[in-house]
Amino acid sequence: SIPWNLERITPPRYRADEYQPPDGGSLVEVYLLDTSIQSDHREIEGRVMVTDFENVPEEDGTRFHRQASKCDSHGTHLAGVVSGRDAGVAKGASMRSLRVLNCQGKGTVSGTLIGLEFIRKSQLVQPVGPLVVLLPLAGGYSRVLNAACQRLARAGVVLVTAAGNFRDDACLYSPASAPEVITVGATNAQDQPVTLGTLGTNFGRCVDLFAPGEDIIGASSDCSTCFVSQSGTSQAAAHVAGIAAMMLSAEPELTLAELRQRLIHFSAKDVINEAWFPEDQRVLTPNLVAALPPSTHGAGWQLFCRTVWSAHSGPTRMATAIARCAPDEELLSCSSFSRSGKRRGERMEAQGGKLVCRAHNAFGGEGVYAIARCCLLPQANCSVHTAPPAEASMGTRVHCHQQGHVLTGCSSHWEVEDLGTHKPPVLRPRGQPNQCVGHREASIHASCCHAPGLECKVKEHGIPAPQGQVTVACEEGWTLTGCSALPGTSHVLGAYAVDNTCVVRSRDVSTTGSTSEEAVTAVAICCRSRHLAQASQELQ
Amino acid sequence: QEDEDGDYEELVLALRSEEDGLAEAPEHGTTATFHRCAKDPWRLPGTYVVVLKEETHLSQSERTARRLQAQAARRGYLTKILHVFHGLLPGFLVKMSGDLLELALKLPHVDYIEEDSSVFAQ
């Protein structure tokens, strides 16, 4: 019977004539930076080319006995998970292995850097099809390792890494913390985060998604036909490397940004029990388990968006946090969140010729997060329109006045410490979809975009008094681009997008003792691209 | 693996080279910074990645590495260049005493220096 992990990543409702996994990934080369491997194992023979690259530290301990099968264990298993004949994800993918980990599974940042450089030079000498680099390793945060990963990613290489097995914030580790790398956490057969002894999978905003990583059957270096079960975020990353290889084989022109968006889009949503994560990390950790797309024909017609959380701003009065999109993504909206509710909103601003999302802490606040909604919108021309605080009782409003531009997101930013102490704002009048409205003492920022066939609509859901959380979702065929809250009072902790749902968090009245009758409304901006849909229909 | 301490292949004697006469201060602009792993047991002091500014050519990387060796030798320190990076990041990997970090940070073209550290199979 099919191993649980392969079943889990296989879409539940695929049509047999459309989706044939056995020979997936044949146009892609996957580089594995790991231990030595037993490349003639029956499961992977002929699929893995062992390069002559080796850069490993001496093993610890004077009496260390180098047992070949132990030296090869980790790498052989991972090669089997990626491309093994019987238990592999991308059975058609070819692999190249570089030895950067010694027989104890230990390597160095410098050895890994030299390995990445080797891959880049190989790519320049002999350009092939799409490349995936699997880094099933982790060390402490390293500026230089992250920088090298960024350079390689910008050279068109897809890097996939383990989130780490430290039951900790993945942002504290490298290469897991590199934004350009696809960072993978581990889940088990029950879709629970994996526990590994006293530790377990890492989590947090630096994780892109999770994948099967417990009791994963794969090639064992104990003998040429042996299989063994191993667990860890390396195994999870190997699944995603295999899925990436299959996606790239089906669509070799996919960019890293497109691939990442597809991985997120086709993942199983909201199946992980978040109670396992520390409370302060739950909102930051993606509730996504990787899966293969239901068809290898891609999904070019979709408008893909993802949510990117910034690092925490820290508690100082003027502290800010910045969330950035990838180079070929568009920032379509910007929101902010503070656990204490003390924040001064957010704004979209240009930085180095690209829009970023900046959130502002308030006096007495414990800090804020900026939340960017990053989307793939070909041929987009986006700009930010700002209205300064109106000061009049009408509230501040701004709209997209350029012809053909549609509203994709609203942000508001205020200088006063606590909007809640001021007169309540007026809710946005209905029937004006291209307009952002906010508190009269706030400046309002509208993200306005022109793109072929782009259409957007506003969807709201309000409740009479703050109840902890208000949500509004975009319907099938529409993608959430903007998520904001009305009004921007001190009750509102912030707004953020989770998949296609806009979540507005506010203080529960029962806990604050407030008697405010103020409504809290979640405002979603839902968009779709008729242009992308038409283009994909023409290809069919 | 690289040689043990004291068994260097490249001993640089304190010979005055033409380069050595050049100014030791970095070019105008921001000072180079030093980084090391926050997890103490994972640190590997004595090996450093010297990262040079983005547009630095291979020849400049090699020249900077040689300059570091020459200046270190003048102060009585042995250094060994383990690898010169090019293709992804400009820079070099050097085995040297931590005492030389201040000197290395002042070299021209240096963006930052990171102490080597361990990575582990996950």
Epitope: D40, R42, E45, M49, R85, K91, C223, T225 | -
Partner: antibody, heavy 115, light 109 residues
Framework: QVQLVQSGAEVKKPGASVKVSCKAS????????ISWVRQAPGQGLEWMGW????????NYAQKLQGRGTMTTDPSTSTAYMELRSLRSDDTAVYYC????????WGQGTTVTVSS | QSALTQPASVSGSPGQSITISCTGT?????????VSWYQQHPGKAPKLMIY???NRPSGVSNRFSGSKSGNTASLTISGLQAEDEADYYC?????????FGGGTKLTVL
Amino acid sequence: QVQLVQSGAEVKKPGASVKVSCKASGYTLTSYGISWVRQAPGQGLEWMGWVSFYNGNTNYAQKLQGRGTMTTDPSTSTAYMELRSLRSDDTAVYYCARGYGMDVWGQGTTVTVSS
Amino acid sequence: QSALTQPASVSGSPGQSITISCTGTSSDVGGYNSVSWYQQHPGKAPKLMIYEVTNRPSGVSNRFSGSKSGNTASLTISGLQAEDEADYYCNSYTSTSMVFGGGTKLTVL
């Protein structure tokens, strides 16, 4: 191109031993082991076992256990199959093939066991 | 390890299609993606025709195709030609070894 070249025909007496060689070329040796397959006259194919160029590990068919030894010499890119205590029913053509996938075959070595 | 079961012989006229079956158990054919088919002409070494159930090596005619259902694998030859007359062997992984079928003699009438 990928090639497996085997040693010449052998005639042996019962109870003797035979050692057949198989020289591999045209591919990365360590990516594949060598399988040994035999075919008695007028009979089908019988898998005898596998040997690794990477680490010398072996995987023998149960029927062969104890009587056969498979080895490799990576320095000469050659695999060997030795069969001891030969019997008349060991008369067969012995083939080497690349890996478990057996995608490339040697030309075969005829071993005749006759008194 | 007992051999996989193949019909001793099959025949067909030029241009016709024939199918050779290969039946094993869940421990071999049914349990692995690695069923191969070999063609052997008299006095020659076997030649790989199909690997991993359905895949054709480069240079093998697309008239040869493989499939599998449960514990039975099949080789289909369409547009039968005189040079297809040969012995055909299937082969599968088992948990620790490899097993061949007894062979099928294909006669082109």
